[in-house]
Interface confidence: medium
């Protein structure tokens, strides 16, 4: 999906209002320096691409993030403020239902959510104004 035409400020407002708090809840008890951030993004569409990937694509050691509260709210924000996003996610959602796994908070998941926090921070305040 091409995130270029999303309403970035509306997504930012959704993040600051709710998603950020859910990420903090997920990470509670974890030191802010515990993980090295290896994922970065250069502009807002790129940040959303990386956020979508880390939030919804199962990875080795962390297959359960898509069912977390922050993920569901992220999905809702993208569906509302990114034209055509919902349609692109139907097949992906159906595939996810087939491989639903037991919800486990692993260290790998904590590391992934730490990366997400950095990506969201970058999305919210790109230094150079990006369209």
């Amino acid at each position: 999906y091409d995130f270029t035409n999303c309403d970035f400020e509306k997504i930012k407002a959704a993040y600051l209002s709710t998603i950020s708090k859910d990420l903090i809840t997920y990470m509670s008890g974890t030191k802010s320096t515990e993980f090295n951030n290896t994922v970065s993004c250069s502009n807002r569409p790129h940040c959303l691409t990386e956020i979508q990937s880390l939030t919804f694509n199962p990875t080795a050691g962390c297959a359960s993030l898509a069912k977390e509260m922050f993920a569901m709210k992220t999905k809702a924000a993208l569906a509302i403020w990114c034209p055509g996003y919902s349609e692109t996610q139907i097949n992906a959602t159906q595939a996810m239902k087939k491989r639903r796994k037991r919800k486990v908070t692993t260290n790998k998941c904590l590391e992934q959510v730490s990366q997400l926090q950095g990506l969201w921070r970058r999305f919210n305040r790109p230094l150079l104004k990006q369209q």
Epitope: A13, S32, N37, R121, R125, L127, L128
Partner: antibody, heavy 120, light 111 residues
């Protein structure tokens, strides 16, 4: 503990340059915008610019764009601000500051400040 | 650039009384219903300290006698009951539009 520790006071001649350092600890340096702010005697706060350590991207106040250079050393979690062609009106306390956790644009952690005196 | 104009430039208030500082922006600092205006307190020889973020949210460890209000272009910082340790210079700051700008500062003293 999250903190920013700046280098010591400097006395410089007009026309010379100064490089102020700001060492970060207690947080993931590469994912936070780092800013520099000037506070001249008897005046208000003035934003110089900012740098994103993740990729070195910078943004400057046009007033300082020609003379200020912001850099980072990710290996030591240190931000630098170099100011060239110094003049008397550059005499000020210079602060580095970390932008907040969420990208809301406020500064939640500040360095202790570095006094730069420009005098012949 | 967005110009922030604080009023008054200086203010003397009795201990226990209310202090009010205003900040007017030359254009709106709102985005999608959120106001990106922040307030700081600076004491002599110290760096600024965050008091209020996004117009009305109390910074970490800030006493609840401090409060902020406003939206669009007009914002207010209020200290409900002035304490001796509140003597300082107060600044508003916006980051809605680059470059980031501060108000000129308001010096608060005890009457």
């Amino acid at each position: 503990e999250v903190q920013l520790v700046q280098s010591g006071a400097e006395v410089k001649k007009p026309g010379s340059s100064v490089k102020v350092s700001c060492k970060a600890s207690g947080f993931t340096f590469s994912t936070y915008n780092m800013h520099w702010v000037k506070h001249a005697p008897g005046q208000g706060l003035e934003w110089i610019g900012a740098i994103y350590p993740g990729n070195g991207e910078t943004s400057y106040n046009q007033k300082f764009k020609d003379r200020a250079t912001l850099t980072v050393d990710k290996s030591t979690s240190t931000a630098y601000m170099e100011l060239s062609s110094l003049r008397s009106e550059d005499t000020a306390v210079y602060y580095c500051a970390r932008e907040d956790d969420y990208g809301e644009g406020y500064f939640d952690v500040w360095g202790q400040g570095t006094t730069v005196t420009v005098s012949s | 650039d967005i110009v922030l104009t604080q009023s008054p430039d200086s203010l003397a208030v009795s201990l226990g009384e209310r202090a009010t500082i205003n900040c007017r922006a030359s254009e709106s600092v709102d985005q999608s219903g959120l106001s990106f205006m922040h307030w700081y307190q600076q004491k002599p020889g110290q760096p600024p300290k965050l008091l209020i973020y996004r117009a009305s949210n109390l910074g970490s460890g800030v006493p609840d006698r401090f409060s902020g209000s406003g939206s669009g272009t007009d914002f207010t910082l209020t200290i409900s009951s002035l304490q001796a340790e509140d003597v300082a210079v107060y600044y508003c700051q916006q980051i809605n539009t680059d470059p980031l700008t501060f108000g000129q500062g308001t010096k608060l003293e005890i009457k």
